[in-house]
């Protein structure tokens, strides 16, 4: 039961991670600038994201502008965009691999095949988590470096935005979920079916056993 629980928890965590990653990539809150300096008359907050930037006036009015040209964008922003999209697609692929693994047990007698697919999906989720982590950490590093750089003007300095925290959460969930999926799989093929969450058909198995011998966790 514990193994099935871990597997379900792993998938739930990766799904939550994927949603967090999607929101993180989409929200224009990677870098936040609060202009309240002596040269600014009206206090305003500038949000910068991967796809657009927004200006929030002290009145609450918000204006957003989508970045015009892809080629005109800084290379680090282009790389962050690419990694974000790739990370989300990789996680989706991981989910498909996991679902394929769950389905395979109905058509494939070999019990190891499902385990291999679950393990593969776990690895794919871990890769997705790492890919999510790279642009987030890179951006955070640039913000922190600017903050402590005495030659960078105060108006050019940024603060860590909510998207970065969501990105870290997404990465953590994907890594944790992927790790759990990897852990639910046995190291070798010698262990019995108790390690796999399978959907069995009602037909009797080739070698019948008493009801007490069937692990309840194998039933979905």
């Amino acid at each position: 039961m514990a193994s099935a629980g871990m597997q379900i928890l792993g998938v739930v965590l990766t799904l939550l991670g994927w949603v967090n990653g999607l929101v993180s990539c989409a929200l224009p809150m990677w870098k936040v600038t609060a202009f309240i300096g002596n040269s600014i008359v009206v206090a305003q907050v500038v949000w910068e994201g991967l796809w657009m930037s927004c200006v929030v006036q002290s009145t609450g009015q918000m204006q957003c502008k989508v970045y015009d040209s892809l080629l005109a964008l800084p290379q680090d922003l282009q790389a962050a965009r690419a990694l974000c999209v790739i990370a989300l697609l990789v996680a989706l692929f991981g989910l498909l691999v996991y679902l394929a693994g769950a389905k395979c047990t109905t058509c494939v007698e070999e019990k190891d095949s499902k385990a291999r697919l679950v393990l593969t999906s776990g690895i794919v989720f871990v890769i997705s988590g790492v890919l999510t982590l790279i642009p987030v950490c890179w951006t955070a590093h640039a913000i922190i470096r600017d903050f402590y750089n005495p030659l960078v003007a105060e108006a050019q300095k940024r603060e860590l935005g909510a998207s970065l925290y969501l990105g870290w959460a997404a990465s953590g969930l994907l890594l944790l979920g992927g790790g759990l999926l990897c852990c639910t799989c046995p190291s070798g093929g010698s262990q019995g079916p108790s390690h796999y969450m399978a959907r069995y058909s009602t037909s009797a198995p080739a070698i019948s056993r008493g009801p007490s011998e069937y692990p309840t966790k194998n039933y979905v």
């Epitope: 002596n38 040269s39 640039a142 750089n149 005495p150 030659l151 960078v152 003007a153 050019q156």
Partner: antibody, heavy 119, light 107 residues
Framework: EVKLVESGGGLVKPGGSLKLSCAAS????????MSWVRQTPAKRLEWVVT????????YYPDSVKGRFTISRDNARNTLYLQMSSLRSEDTAMYYC????????????WGQGTLVTVST | DIQMTQSPASLSASVGETVTITCRAS??????LAWYQQKQGKSPQLLVY???LLVDGVPSRFSGSRSGTQFSLKINSLQSEDVARYYC?????????FGSGTKLEIK
């Protein structure tokens, strides 16, 4: 109008010491990062030192670390550069510089004070 | 330390011409580059920061650009008052270093 006036330059023997001052006016001194940059006789510019607005953080290149000390007196609107163990390669025009709220880099430069290290 | 290689060392052009001064960083400095102008007998003045942003009051004929670790300062329609020494400077990390300078003269 931003005004930075350097003083204290002069002729000094190798191994000697000198203290440069920079009197600031026309702006709120205690909110800006301040720096010293020198220009050698060969017209090369070299960053010497930077100090944060409050004076709590200082930044030096290895070439002057341990020999030069930057300080500021925000009450007197004055920036200082204490130079010791002077070498011939320290001969240069020393500029006092103020940072800016909007612009990166060395935004406002004083007229400079000449330091000559020679026997 | 990051080295800034500036070229050419000197440049002579006619009024109305377009001139370009280049600066190459020995390693990645992102867009942490500034350009300064120093007229004869005067202190240097900040022209461009963040590789492309012009300081208020600087004529629009000046423009900065970046391509990887190579940076350029372009002066369109050169004026006689542009005669000066131009320096690039990175502020990516300590120590901050300057280019050797470019002396611009009018033919």
């Amino acid at each position: 109008e931003v005004k930075l006036v350097e003083s204290g330059g002069g002729l000094v023997k190798p191994g000697g010491s000198l203290k440069l001052s920079c009197a600031a006016s026309g702006f709120t001194f205690n909110v800006y990062t301040m720096s010293w940059v020198r220009q050698t006789p060969a017209k090369r510019l070299e960053w010497v030192v930077t100090i944060s607005s409050g004076g709590g953080r200082t930044y030096y290149p290895d070439s002057v670390k341990g020999r030069f000390t930057i300080s500021r007196d925000n009450a007197r609107n004055t920036l200082y550069l204490q130079m010791s163990s002077l070498r011939s390669e320290d001969t240069a025009m020393y500029y006092c510089i103020r940072g800016d709220y909007r612009y990166d880099g060395f935004a406002y430069w004083g007229q400079g004070t000449l330091v000559t290290v020679s026997t | 330390d990051i080295q800034m290689t500036q070229s050419p060392a000197s440049l002579s052009a006619s009024v109305g011409e377009t001139v370009t001064i280049t600066c190459r960083a020995s390693e990645n400095i992102d867009s942490y580059l500034a350009w300064y102008q120093q007229k004869q007998g005067k202190s240097p003045q900040l022209l461009v920061y963040a590789s492309t942003l012009l300081v208020d009051g600087v004529p629009s004929r000046f423009s900065g650009s970046r391509s990887g670790t190579q940076f350029s300062l372009k002066i369109n329609s050169l004026q006689s008052e542009d005669v000066a020494r131009y320096y690039c400077q990175h502020y990516y990390s300590i120590p901050y270093t300057f280019g050797s300078g470019t002396k611009l003269e009018i033919k």
